[in-house]
């Protein structure tokens, strides 16, 4: 079986301030088992945007039902976008581990650009 890939099909997305951004992400396999997390930016300074496993992320909704066993769509919507939300977003697959999950594979990233709301 081929190794899981994380696909972010959109290289960039342009959203008006105040609107909702949809960031698409799919996995090519159900294996390995483990959660998805979304980050803005890469490296040690990256911001956690959504964690499938825990936390409260009020501005984020998932496009699909992540609790479904066969789900491979990890796309998210971020509401009420502001200029501070601009950046590159990465969909990252983790492999279930003990005590901590281990980062397994990242998508190529989607750059979110925010344009001012027309006055």
């Amino acid at each position: 079986e081929e190794e899981l890939q994380v696909i972010q099909p959109d290289k960039s997305v342009l959203v008006a301030a105040g609107e909702t951004a949809t960031l698409r992400c799919t996995a090519t396999s159900l294996i390995p088992v483990g959660p998805i997390q979304w980050f803005r930016g890469a490296g040690p300074g990256r911001e956690l945007i959504y964690n499938q496993k825990e936390g409260h992320f009020p501005r984020v909704t998932t496009v699909s039902d992540l609790t479904k066993r066969n789900n491979m769509d990890f796309s998210i919507r971020i509401g009420n976008i502001t200029p501070a939300d601009a950046g590159t977003y990465y969909c990252v697959k983790f492999r279930k581990g003990s005590p901590d999950d281990v980062e397994f594979k990242s998508g190529a990233g989607t750059e979110l650009s925010v344009r001012a709301k027309p006055s």
């Epitope: 301030a17 105040g18 803005r40 930016g41 490296g43 040690p44 300074g45 990256r46 911001e47 956690l48 945007i49 964690n51 825990e54 936390g55 409260h56 992320f57 009020p58 501005r59 984020v60 009420n80 502001t82 200029p83 501070a84 939300d85 709301k117």
Partner: antibody, heavy 118, light 108 residues
Framework: VQLVESGGGVVRPGESLRLSCAAS????????MNWVRQAPGEGLEWVSR????????DYAESVKGRFTISRDNSENTLYLQMNSLRAEDTAVYYC????????????WGLGALVTVSS | ETVLTQSPATLSVSPGERATLSCRAS??????LAWHQQKPGQAPRLLIY???NRATGIPDRFSGSGSGTDFTLTISSLQTEDSAVYYC??????????FGGGTKVEIK
Amino acid sequence: VQLVESGGGVVRPGESLRLSCAASGFSFSSYAMNWVRQAPGEGLEWVSRINSGGGGTDYAESVKGRFTISRDNSENTLYLQMNSLRAEDTAVYYCAKQYDWNGFFDYWGLGALVTVSS
Amino acid sequence: ETVLTQSPATLSVSPGERATLSCRASQTVGSKLAWHQQKPGQAPRLLIYDATNRATGIPDRFSGSGSGTDFTLTISSLQTEDSAVYYCQQYYYWPPYRFGGGTKVEIK
């Protein structure tokens, strides 16, 4: 949600102090955290922010190069290392939880008083 | 940098009356504005976020309105326990996070 600061006290100008903020009642490692201060009789001044993982930090110009924010997600604790303290750093220092990565402060600690005086 | 200007600096209101506090931003902050209440000797407490949403446990006599650059916090029927300083905070552009200078609400 509970945030409890400690480590405040009286120091002389040029000295150092480290504040701690013990967090409980929420998934600490999922949230950005901040320090906000309030000089006696004055308003609120944001001091510093650290992202959920601890690798990203921001500082107010007034403290840049002197203060360092850090966190220990395994201990659910936020820190503020304050070096080269000045009289104008005298304030109550609050730790504040951020609602999401780009948001307001939804919970505040009770504060720790730092007095810098010769 | 976005500057938040609160007015009036002090507001004196009789119990049961309406209190209206203003916060003006130097540039648009969309709906990304919060209000915090600070009673004497206490830590701040979140009242309103995203300009109009009441935080958990906040009585419905507190309401927020506005968007863009002009925002209002209204206390519909002032209670004695509402005596406090009220701060607005923007989170549209950051860093830095900015607070207004505060409005002190006194009971007449």
